[in-house]
C-alpha cells in the first residue's frame, strides 16, 4: 500500500506502561520537531480482548489522553477505582499529531494488571509488642474490588536481632501475631504481600516493607520477681 501522505511525523519513542499497585500510567519520549512552532500533541487509544479501538477520553476511561501535550497518560489519576479493570486484557496504542499530520501508531504489548503488576509492600504497618509476642497490623498494597477473583496473602520475615531469619505465613488476614518469642528481646521484621489471581493461577510476589525493630514486653512473672 502507498504510504499515507499525512503520516509524516515521527512516532513517539520508547512507550512504557507502569503498573505499580493500583497505578496504570503510560509514558513515552516526546517527539521533537525543529521546524514547528506549534506543539506536537498525542492521542492514546485502547482496546481489550476482541473490542475495537477506543479513544482514551473522559467518557470512555475517565481521563483525557487525546490531543494532549503531556508525555504521559495516567489512567488512574482521577480516583482509586479509575483505570482499566484488573483482569482485562488491555492493549494501548499511541501516536503523535500536528495539525493534519500524524505519526504511525505505536502499539504496546498487551497487559493484564493482575498478571503484570509490581506489588508494593503492605502499608500503614503498626506493631504492638506483647509478652513474648508481636502483633502486626497493616493495610493491603491496594484495594481489590472483587476478592473472589484475586486476593492478597501475607508473609512476615522476622529475626531476633543478630539471629537467623524466619518466615511466617501465608496469612489472609491483615493482622498477624508472632507468638512464642523471647520476652524483653529485640526482634526485627519485614512484611510482604503476595497477590493471587484465581482465574489464571498467577501470583505476584510483592516488595518487602522496610525493616523495623521492636522489643517484646517482659514476662509478667519476671517483672514480679524484680
Amino acid at each position: 500500500a502507498p504510504p499515507d501522505p499525512l503520516s509524516q511525523l515521527p512516532a513517539p519513542q520508547h512507550p512504557k506502561i507502569r503498573l505499580y499497585n493500583a497505578e496504570q500510567v503510560l509514558s513515552w519520549e516526546p517527539v521533537a520537531l525543529s521546524n514547528s512552532t506549534r506543539p506536537v500533541v498525542y492521542q492514546v487509544q485502547f482496546k481489550y480482548t476482541d473490542s475495537k479501538w477506543f479513544t482514551a477520553d473522559i467518557m470512555s476511561i475517565g481521563v483525557n489522553c487525546t490531543q494532549i501535550t503531556a508525555t504521559e497518560c495516567d489512567f488512574t489519576a482521577a480516583s482509586p477505582s479509575a483505570g482499566f479493570p484488573m483482569d482485562f486484557n488491555v492493549t494501548l496504542r499511541l501516536r503523535a499529531e500536528l495539525g493534519a499530520l500524524h505519526s504511525a501508531w505505536v502499539t504496546m504489548p498487551w497487559f493484564q494488571h493482575y498478571r503484570n503488576v509490581t506489588v508494593g509492600p503492605p502499608e500503614n504497618i503498626e506493631v504492638t509488642p506483647g509478652e513474648g509476642s508481636l502483633i502486626i497490623r497493616f493495610s493491603s498494597p491496594f484495594d481489590i474490588a472483587d476478592t473472589s477473583t484475586a486476593f492478597f496473602c501475607y508473609y512476615v520475615h522476622y529475626w531476633e536481632k543478630g539471629g537467623i531469619q524466619q518466615v511466617k505465613g501465608p496469612f489472609r488476614s491483615n493482622s498477624i501475631s508472632l507468638d512464642n518469642l523471647k520476652p524483653s528481646r529485640v526482634y526485627c521484621l519485614q512484611v510482604q504481600a503476595q497477590l493471587l489471581w484465581n482465574k489464571s493461577n498467577i501470583f505476584r510476589v510483592g516488595h518487602l516493607s522496610n525493616i523495623s525493630c521492636y522489643e517484646t514486653m517482659a514476662d509478667a512473672s519476671t517483672e514480679l520477681q524484680q
Epitope: 476511561i61 477505582s81 479509575a82 483482569d87
Partner: nanobody, 119 residues
Framework: QVQLQESGGGLVQAGGSLRLSCTAS?????MGWFRQAPGKQRELVAR???????DYADSVKGRFTISRNTAENTAYLQMNSLKPEDTGVYYC????????????????WGQGTLVTVSS
C-alpha cells in the same frame, strides 16, 4: 455537570410490557439500569458497553432487552413479561470503563423512575 434523565416508568399488569429510556449528557462507555425493590438493595438489571456487549441479571434474562442509540447517548430497557417481583425504582447509571467493572460501581446515577407491576 453529568445528567441522566429517565422516563417510561409506570403501573402495568403482570405479563405486560414497559420501555424505559435514559438520555445522558455525554457518550459514556457503559450505560445501564439498576433497580431497587422495596426493602431490598439496589441491584444491576442490565448494562450495555460501547462495543455492543450486554450483560443481564439472571432474573431478567430472556424478558428484558437493553439497547443503545450511541448517536443520541440514549439507552433503552425493553421489559416484557413483567412480574410483580419486577416492581421497584429503576435507576439509569453511566460512566467510563473503570476498575469497578465487576461488580459495576457506576460513576453517575439518575433520579430513578418507579415501575409497579400489579398481579
Amino acid at each position: 455537570q453529568v445528567q441522566l434523565q429517565e422516563s417510561g416508568g409506570g403501573l402495568v399488569q403482570a405479563g405486560g410490557s414497559l420501555r424505559l429510556s435514559c438520555t445522558a449528557s455525554g457518550a459514556y462507555f457503559i450505560m445501564g439500569w439498576f433497580r431497587q425493590a422495596p426493602g431490598k438493595q439496589r441491584e444491576l438489571v442490565a448494562r450495555t458497553i460501547r462495543d455492543g456487549t450486554t450483560d443481564y441479571a439472571d432474573s431478567v434474562k430472556g424478558r428484558f432487552t437493553i439497547s443503545r442509540n450511541t448517536a443520541e447517548n440514549t439507552a433503552y430497557l425493553q421489559m416484557n413479561s413483567l412480574k410483580p417481583e419486577d416492581t421497584g425504582v429503576y435507576y439509569c447509571a453511566a460512566g467510563p470503563l473503570s476498575k469497578s467493572f465487576a461488580p459495576w460501581d457506576p460513576a453517575y446515577w439518575g433520579q430513578g423512575t418507579l415501575v409497579t407491576v400489579s398481579s
